[in-house]
């Protein structure tokens, strides 16, 4: 299984989308875990709703949010307020009983904003003033179902 490398800027959000065969994994909850060492166990960070039929609802653990679009076959994980300590190897998993099938391996890299680096030395400043617009990249975005639940009549 290939490892996908995703980079995010510290302090911003990084969105990860893991795709899967919708019918093969129908009825299975999904999880996002962090691998401890190259051959170590994968420590669960967050998993989708305990009742599978509500898997499309966002589930949060700390700054990590997960939601599953079971029809499209896409589970989306959002790492909010990315910190240097969030860097590492993760897995998207499909849960069946006590077994976990790896859907995707993801290497998260956190990029530091050079303007926040107090030891950066002298900063070069252009003579003419210029505006700088930082572009925030959302990796593999997917639409989450807009819903108020319980259903409205």
């Amino acid at each position: 299984l290939n490892t996908t490398v995703l980079q995010g800027m510290a302090g911003q959000s990084l969105r990860v989308s893991c795709t899967y065969d919708a019918l093969k994994h129908w009825g299975r909850r999904k999880a996002w875990c962090r691998q401890l060492g190259e051959e170590g166990p994968c420590q669960r960070v967050v998993s989708t709703h305990g009742v599978w039929l509500l898997a499309f609802l966002k589930k949060r653990n700390g700054s990590t949010v997960i939601a599953d679009d079971t029809l499209a076959g896409t589970v989306t994980i959002t790492l909010k307020n990315l910190q240097a300590g969030d860097a590492g190897l993760y897995q998207c998993q499909s849960l069946r009983g006590r077994e976990a099938e790896v859907l995707q391996k993801v290497l998260v890299e956190v990029l530091e904003d050079p303007l926040d680096d107090q030891d950066a030395g002298d900063l070069w400043v252009p003579e003419e003033s210029s505006s700088f617009e930082g572009a925030q990249v959302e990796h593999s975005t997917s639409r989450n179902q807009e819903t108020s639940f319980p259903p409205t009549s």
């Epitope: 919708a22 019918l23 129908w26 009825g27 009742v51 599978w52 039929l53 509500l54 898997a55 499309f56 599953d68 679009d69 079971t70 029809l71 499209a72 076959g73 639409r143 179902q145 807009e146 819903t147 259903p151 009549s153």
Partner: antibody
Framework: EVQLLESGGGLVQPGGSLRLSCAAS????????MSWVRQAPGKGLEWVSV????????YYADSVKGRFTISRDNSKNTLYLQMNSLRAEDTAVYYC???????????WGQGTLVTVSS | EIVMTQSPATLSVSPGERATLSCRAS??????LAWYQQKPGQAPRLLIY???TRATGIPARFSGSGSGTEFTLTISSLQSEDFAVYYC?????????FGGGTKVEIK
């Protein structure tokens, strides 16, 4: 208020075709999975087909696979079911239903009757 | 395909009495089960999801219970508007399937 209004039903001969429509209002149509569920006269409910909010994913019951096609026009807030090679056993009231990606049917239309008979 | 079996097929109850409807799945569906109500000439209406959670606007006299393969829908005190056909639906196995229904009629 969520409203789903089916149309297009009627009498058709075996082997014929029919196109059902479902006009939706009262919610953000493009954000929801939509399904067709049918009910033969005096019988129970049978799920027929589903389409994701974007229209990118479609699935069918084995009984209609290859004959029916589900589609949607999000700009018109309308769901469709193109039914070809119709058989007598397709005779039923066809409901369109707004649901979740896990096929929980939150809201239903009033249904449209399709009769396949010679 | 998961087979959902509902019993009894018909239940005769007097207004004000309790009605207990059963639904059995051929395999465990955990709590991924829904109940729908259908009155004559009308579309079905979602009553219960997650085996026990009432949908918005559903009166408290309706309650669902069970997990795995055995489920129950209880109507604590039948009102005239509750006489209808009730269907259960399993969701976690493809394709989603419904039970054959239980008709609750006036005794």
């Amino acid at each position: 208020e969520v409203q789903l209004l089916e149309s297009g039903g009627g009498l058709v001969q075996p082997g014929g075709s029919l196109r059902l429509s479902c006009a939706a209002s009262g919610f953000t149509f493009s954000s929801y999975a939509m399904s067709w569920v049918r009910q033969a006269p005096g019988k129970g409910l049978e799920w027929v087909s589903v389409i994701s909010g974007s229209g990118g994913s479609t699935y069918y019951a084995d009984s209609v696979k290859g004959r029916f096609t589900i589609s949607r026009d999000n700009s018109k807030n309308t769901l469709y079911l193109q039914m070809n090679s119709l058989r007598a056993e397709d005779t039923a009231v066809y409901y369109c239903a707004k649901g979740t990606p896990t096929l929980l049917f939150q809201h239903w239309g009033q249904g449209t009757l399709v009769t396949v008979s010679s | 395909e998961i087979v959902m079996t509902q019993s009894p097929a018909t239940l005769s109850v007097s207004p004000g009495e309790r009605a207990t409807l059963s639904c059995r799945a051929s395999q465990s569906v955990s709590s991924n089960l829904a109940w729908y109500q259908q009155k004559p000439g009308q579309a079905p209406r979602l009553l219960i999801y997650g085996a026990s959670t009432r949908a918005t606007g559903i009166p408290a006299r309706f309650s669902g219970s069970g997990s795995g393969t055995e489920f129950t829908l209880t109507i604590s005190s039948l009102q005239s508007e509750d006489f209808a056909v009730y269907y259960c639906q399993q969701l976690p196995y493809w394709p989603p399937t419904f039970g054959g229904g239980t008709k609750v009629e006036i005794k």
